[in-house]
């Protein structure tokens, strides 16, 4: 029966005399007058079985003590840790010449675990053991035992087991503890590869190469290997494993991503929170599912947010010139969360009597710069038929439009070719400028070419350079533009519309809003 004692993880104990309860019962030769098993109390007042001998009076002592058979357990090299106390010969009067201060350690390999006798000739010497310190007497009165500790190793071993023997040659000595152990590199996980308990090699300098196996839910990146050193330490980790998609490293394991998280690839990255507008409903997700109405394009990475098709373009303006039409519009209010927005133009030729009877324009119509995939917000359409009604649709599209096409993504305008539009307006004036508004007035075009149905005012902040403009329509020849920013330069254009369509815009009028209201008359050129 043995009690449990704690030793380093890289040592496997084969024999520990301190853990044995009851008599050790090792074999002594001679049976009497040599080594004697004696129980002493340790610092915790627990009895320890020790072997003592103190035959310092007689010369030529040859007292042997042999352990029981010790199994090798596959170890090729074993270590013997001896804790002992040794009396200083000077403390023993009248023993000079016969008293010694060393003893000898021997071993004998055997497959037989029941050898009853000590045959000295079978044993090989490991070493002569001397004390680092010897004591006049060993003070355990205060229960602090002054012990020498010596460690020796022996190998390579090949038989099933072995015996140890201690030869006394005339010392006053007590063996307090004998521990036999071998060293192993303990089971460990490095770089997500598990390396098994590995017994060290036969030599004190040998390295044992060990291949690791990837932990659960991981895969090899490079073949994982390590070397088990003679001291039971793992050395030189090579290669590694990576957690599979849907798993991340936590404390040397690959754990499934939590709900609401995902990992798309086998990498050393952690699980990431699902991107905006997506979710995962199970552990170990490799991607996240898009929310209803949101989509992921084929070439979108799993890390990208789910997006949706854009809303319709804004502020579509048409300008008819005989059999050509110029269309211009603003970006949609909602791009769907994507940058890859483009525009497609749909041309429909409609009957004069029934505008609902429309059909595609066909290949004779030409578009500049192109009909589909427009990156700019304007297009020129030429080679139209004269005196014909056309409906043009501008569709805003992005990478996910194909998953959910809807009329809400387009804006349309209907025009008739080959009717003269009004001429441009010659003079636009700023009648009053305040901090937040500008009052505009203008003259009728020189050539109205019909009844002017309305005027269209286009304006934008000067430094926006027409990237973002607004449109105001009015039947009168004046209007108040409100909701402006103070001390900001604005550019205004006005044009007229008749049944034939819109005329050209006027020359720009530049006005800067004030901090103090004032009346300023524009002359069609810059005004401040």
């Amino acid at each position: 029966v043995t009690g449990s004692r704690v030793y380093p993880a890289n040592e496997v104990t084969l024999l520990d005399s301190r853990s044995v309860q009851g008599e050790l019962g090792w074999i002594a030769s001679p049976l009497e007058g040599g080594w004697e098993e004696v129980s002493i109390m340790d610092e915790k007042n627990t009895p320890i079985r020790t072997y003592q001998v103190c035959n310092v009076m007689e010369a030529s002592q040859n007292n042997w003590l042999r352990t029981d058979w010790i199994t090798r357990e596959g170890a090729q090299r074993v270590y013997i840790e001896i804790k002992f106390t040794l009396r200083d010969c000077n403390s023993l009067p009248g023993v000079m010449g016969t008293c010694k201060e060393t003893f000898n350690l021997y071993y004998y390999e055997s497959d037989n675990d029941k050898e009853r006798f000590i045959r000295e000739s079978q044993f090989g010497k490991i070493d002569t053991i001397a004390a680092d310190e010897s004591f006049t007497q060993v003070d355990i009165g205060d229960r602090i035992m002054k012990l020498n500790t010596e460690i020796r190793d022996v190998g390579p071993l090949s038989k099933k087991g072995f015996y140890l023997a201690f030869q006394d040659v005339g010392a006053c000595i007590a063996l307090v503890s004998v521990r036999v152990f071998y060293k192993k590199c303990p089971l460990t996980v490095r770089n997500l590869a598990q390396f098994p308990d590995t017994i060290t090699g036969a030599d004190t300098s040998s390295l044992v190469e060990v291949r690791g196996s990837c932990v659960n839910n991981s895969e090899e990146k490079d073949v994982p290997k390590m070397y088990c050193g003679a001291d039971g330490e793992w050395l030189v980790p090579i290669g590694n494993c990576l957690c599979n998609a849907g798993h991340e490293e936590q404390n040397g394991e690959c754990q499934a991503c939590k709900i609401g998280y995902y990992k798309a690839l086998s990498t050393d990255a952690s699980c990431a929170k699902c991107p905006p507008h997506s979710y995962s409903v199970w552990e170990g997700a490799t991607s996240c599912t898009c929310d209803r109405g949101f989509f992921r394009a084929d070439n979108d990475a799993a890390s990208m947010p789910c997006t949706r098709p854009p809303s319709a373009p804004l502020n579509l303006i048409s300008n008819v010139n005989e059999t050509s039409v110029n269309l211009e519009w603003s970006s949609p209010q909602n791009t769907g969360g994507r940058q890859d927005i483009s525009y497609n133009v749909v041309c429909k030729k409609c009957g004069a009597g029934d505008p609902s009877k429309c059909r595609p324009c066909g290949s004779g119509v030409h578009y500049t710069p192109q009909q589909n995939g427009l990156k700019t917000t304007r297009v020129s359409i030429t080679d139209l038929l004269a005196h014909t009604n056309y409906t043009f649709e501008i569709w805003a599209v992005n990478g996910v439009s194909k998953y959910n096409p809807s009329p809400d993504q387009s804006v349309s305008v209907t025009v008739t070719t080959n009717q003269a539009a009004p001429s441009s307006i010659a003079l636009v004036q700023a009648k009053e400028v305040t901090r937040y508004s500008v009052a505009l007035a203008w003259l009728e075009p020189d050539r109205p070419n019909g009844v002017i149905l309305e005027y269209e005012v286009k304006y934008y902040e000067k430094d926006q350079n027409e990237r973002s403009y607004r449109i105001v329509r009015t039947a009168a020849r004046n209007t108040d533009i409100k909701g402006l920013n103070p001390l900001t330069s604005y550019v205004f254009h006005v044009r007229a519309r008749t049944a034939a369509g819109y005329g050209d815009f006027s020359e720009p009028l530049e006005v800067t809003t004030n901090t103090v209201p004032s009346r300023i008359i524009g002359d069609g050129a810059n005004s401040t």
Epitope: G33, V38, I40, M41, Q52, C54, N55, V56, M57, E58, A59, T85, L86, R87, S91, L92, P93, G94, V95, M96, G97, T98, F135, T136, Q137, V138, D139, I140, G141, C172, I173, A174
Partner: antibody, heavy 121, light 106 residues
Amino acid sequence: QVQLLQSGAEVKKPGASVKVPCKASGYTFTSRAMSWVRQAPGQGLEWMGWINTNTGNPTYAQGFTGRFVFSLDTSVSTAYLQISSLKAEDTAVYYCARVRLTVYGDGMDVWGQGTLVTVSS
Amino acid sequence: EIVLTQSPATLSVSPGERATLSCRASQSVSSNPPWYQQKPGQAPRLLIYGASTRATGIPDRFSASGSGTDFTLTISRVEPEDFAVYYCQQYGSSWTFGQGTKVEIK
């Protein structure tokens, strides 16, 4: 069993000598040292010294050099204490005692029954 | 030379009581001293030696402790046969005894 047998009482005149034997039995005589202890009447114990029974090498305590001699006859497993030039103050019981040496401490584990030496004119 | 002083010189106890005997060294000694028991007209008998080990045949009511300069022999429950004189002893290059403590019946 282990025994130490001493001779009976001795009465000696001052200036005379006495040789007190101590015969060992029940163990290997040469394996253990032999101590000699004096106890004067009504007094405590006094260690006189010991002899290495293997080498014959004696060790004398302070105050017991000169007139006191330890000797052996290993052939009959006997140790001897010889006192010469006896004085009245040498009157005492003389004990032989086998020495027990251990790493953790020494002691005298087997004692003879003692020999009373009386010095009187 | 190390001098051992035992106290008290006489200790009166009743059978069944605990007896504590003291042994003080004039300088620090490196291990527990052995203790001896001597009854009138008899040779001393070894009670306890190194590492507080009881000698063969000594009952476990006898125990020893201490370190440095102060040592104690304890008889946990004194029996009638325990009334005697007790000596401690120091060993080193020269051995010396204390003057003894007499344990008598109260």
